[in-house]
C-alpha cells in the first residue's frame, strides 16, 4: 500500500512540477524592471524567454517577440534549451509513469516491468527538474551579473550616441515558479525511484533441505518463493491533472510600482 501511495504521490508531484516548468517557460516575467532606484517611471519593462514587454501606466501592454535566433545571447539560448529539454523529458516521464502506476492494469504486465518503468520515469523527472533548476539559475546568474554591470554604468556615466535611462532588471515571477516547479519535479522523481525499490521483485530462493526418512532416501526441495511486497490490483479512480500554463500579458493590468494596483 505504501509503495502505491509513494508512486501515486510521486506522479502527482511530478505532474504539478512539470506543469509549473511549462508555465515558467511560457511566462513573460523572467526579468522585471528594478524599481528600487527608479520608481518614478510611468513605463514598466519586463522580459521573458520568448519576448519582451512594456506596460505603460495607461494600462496598454506591448510585447515583442525575439524574432531572431542568431542575434540572441548564447546564455538565453542555453536557458531556452534547458527548459525545453526539461519539459520534453518531463512529458516522456509522465507518459511512462502512467503505465507504470501500480493502480493501473495493462494486460499481463509484470511487476518487474512496472518497476523498471517507474525507475525510468523517476530518473527522467529528476533530470527534468535539474534542467529546470539549472535553466532558471543560469538566467538568475545572468541577471545578477547584468544588474551590477548596469549599476556601475549608472555611476560611471554612459557614453554613446543614444541617451536612455539605464533600465536595470531584477528577478521576475517566472524564476520563482521555475525553481519551485523544478524542485517539485525533482522530489517527484525521487519518490518514483523510492517506489521502484518496493515494486522490484526480489528472488528469495530457499536452500534445499534434505530429509532422511528411515529406509528411504527422499530429497525434498521446496520451490523458490517469489517475495513481493506488492499488493493485488488496487483499483482506484485515476485523476488526470491538467496543468495549464497561461500568460497574463494581454490583459490590461497595472504594474506593481504604482499605488493603484
Amino acid at each position: 500500500m505504501a509503495v502505491t501511495a509513494c508512486q501515486g504521490l510521486g506522479f502527482v508531484v511530478s505532474l504539478i512540477g512539470i506543469a509549473g516548468i511549462i508555465a515558467a517557460t511560457c511566462m513573460d516575467q523572467w526579468s522585471t524592471q528594478d524599481l528600487y532606484n527608479n520608481p518614478v517611471t510611468a513605463v514598466f519593462n519586463y522580459q521573458g524567454l520568448w519576448r519582451s514587454c512594456v506596460r505603460e501606466s495607461s494600462g496598454f501592454t506591448e510585447c515583442r517577440g525575439y524574432f531572431t535566433l542568431l542575434g540572441l545571447p548564447a546564455m538565453l539560448q542555453a536557458v531556452r534549451a534547458l527548459m525545453i529539454v526539461g519539459i520534453v523529458l518531463g512529458a516522456i516521464g509522465l507518459l511512462v509513469s502512467i503505465f507504470a502506476l501500480k493502480c493501473i492494469r495493462i494486460g499481463s504486465m509484470e511487476d518487474s516491468a512496472k518497476a523498471n518503468m517507474t525507475l525510468t520515469s523517476g530518473i527522467m523527472f529528476i533530470v527534468s527538474g535539474l534542467c529546470a533548476i539549472a535553466g532558471v539559475s543560469v538566467f538568475a546568474n545572468m541577471l545578477v551579473t547584468n544588474f551590477w554591470m548596469s549599476t556601475a554604468n549608472m555611476y560611471t556615466g554612459m557614453g554613446g550616441m543614444v541617451q536612455t535611462v539605464q533600465t536595470r532588471y531584477t528577478f521576475g515571477a517566472a524564476l520563482f515558479v521555475g525553481w519551485v516547479a523544478g524542485g517539485l519535479t525533482l522530489i517527484g522523481g525521487v519518490m518514483m525511484c523510492i517506489a521502484c525499490r518496493g515494486l522490484a521483485p526480489e528472488e528469495t530462493n530457499y536452500k534445499a533441505v534434505s530429509y532422511h526418512a528411515s529406509g528411504h532416501s527422499v530429497a525434498y526441495k521446496p520451490g523458490g518463493f517469489k517475495a513481493s511486497t506488492g499488493f493485488g490490483s488496487n483499483t482506484k479512480n485515476k485523476k488526470i491533472y491538467d496543468g495549464g500554463a497561461r500568460t497574463e500579458d494581454e490583459v490590461q493590468s497595472y504594474p506593481s510600482k504604482h499605488d493603484y494596483v
Partner: antibody, heavy 117, light 113 residues
Framework: VQLQQSGAELVRPGTSVKVSCKAS????????IEWVKQRPGQGLEWIGM????????HYNEKFKVKATLTADKSSSTAYMQLSSLTSDDSAVYFC???????????WGQGTLVTVSA | DILLTQSPLSLTVTAGEKVTMSCKSS????????????LTWYQQKPGQPPKLLTY???TRESGVPVRFTGSGSGTDFTLTISSVQAEDLAVYYC?????????FGGGTKLEIK
C-alpha cells in the same frame, strides 16, 4: 468617445468643490482618467490619474493634499474634489482619457473653477 | 520633475509655410525596453481643450492631418507642420509621458499672418 464635464463653479476661499466627468461611448473601467489644470492664459499641469476599474489613484505630489480623485463605475463618472480653495486654484480643470504612450487621447471640455470672496 | 523647454515661445508665419518647433527635455524620454520615446504633442485652439497630435514622439494620432510630423529622440524633439493652414492657429504643447509627475512644456504659440 465623449467626456462631459460639469459646469463652471464660483466658490468661496477655504471651501471645497467637486468637479465631475461623465464618460460615454467606451468601456469606462478599461482606461485611466487623468486630470489636468490650466490657469488662465497659462500652461498645463498634471494633477493625477485614477483607474476607474480598481479605484486606485496616482497623484502629482504637488496636488496630493489639494485633490481627491474618485470614480463611480455604475454611472461611468469620475470626480475630482478640490479642498481648502485659494485664489491659486482658480483655473480650468480638464479630465482626459489615457492613451498610448501615456498620452491624453480624449479630453473633456473643461470646468472653470473661480475662487473669489 | 522633468523640465520641458519649448522654443520659440511664439511664431508668426504665412499660410503654406513650413513650421518647426522644438521641445527639449531635462532627461531622456527614451525607454530602453521598446526603444520608444515617451513624448506627446498637443494642439490647443483658443477656448478649446488640447487635442492629441502625436504620441511616442512620432506616431500620428488617427484623424490628425499628415502635415503634422513629430520627430526626435532622447532629449530633443521637434514638431513640424509641412504647410501651415489658417486653422492651425493654436498653442502647441509637448508632454513627458515617461516620468512621474507628467509634465508639459510651456507651449509654442503659432500665429498666422
Amino acid at each position: 468617445v465623449q467626456l462631459q464635464q460639469s459646469g463652471a463653479e464660483l466658490v468661496r476661499p477655504g471651501t471645497s468643490v467637486k468637479v465631475s466627468c461623465k464618460a460615454s461611448r467606451y468601456a469606462f473601467t478599461n482606461y485611466l482618467i487623468e486630470w489636468v489644470k490650466q490657469r488662465p492664459g497659462q500652461g498645463l499641469e498634471w494633477i493625477g490619474m485614477i483607474n476607474p476599474g480598481s479605484g486606485g489613484t496616482h497623484y502629482n505630489e504637488k496636488f496630493k493634499v489639494k485633490a481627491t480623485l474618485t470614480a463611480d463605475k455604475s454611472s461611468s463618472t469620475a470626480y475630482m474634489q478640490l479642498s481648502s480653495l485659494t485664489s491659486d486654484d482658480s483655473a480650468v480643470y480638464f479630465c482626459a482619457r489615457g492613451g498610448f504612450g501615456n498620452s491624453f487621447a480624449y479630453w473633456g471640455q473643461g470646468t472653470l473653477v473661480t475662487v473669489s470672496a | 520633475d522633468i523640465l520641458l523647454t519649448q522654443s520659440p515661445l511664439s511664431l508668426t508665419v504665412t499660410a503654406g509655410e513650413k513650421v518647426t518647433m522644438s521641445c527639449k527635455s531635462s532627461q531622456s524620454l527614451l525607454n530602453g525596453g521598446n526603444l520608444k520615446n515617451y513624448l506627446t504633442w498637443y494642439q490647443q485652439k483658443p477656448g478649446q481643450p488640447p487635442k492629441l497630435l502625436t504620441y511616442w514622439a512620432s506616431t500620428r494620432e488617427s484623424g490628425v492631418p499628415v502635415r503634422f510630423t513629430g520627430s526626435g529622440s532622447g532629449t530633443d524633439f521637434t514638431l513640424t507642420i509641412s504647410s501651415v493652414q489658417a486653422e492651425d492657429l493654436a498653442v502647441y504643447y509637448c508632454q513627458n509621458g515617461y516620468f512621474y509627475p507628467y509634465t508639459f512644456g510651456g507651449g509654442t504659440k503659432l500665429e498666422i499672418k
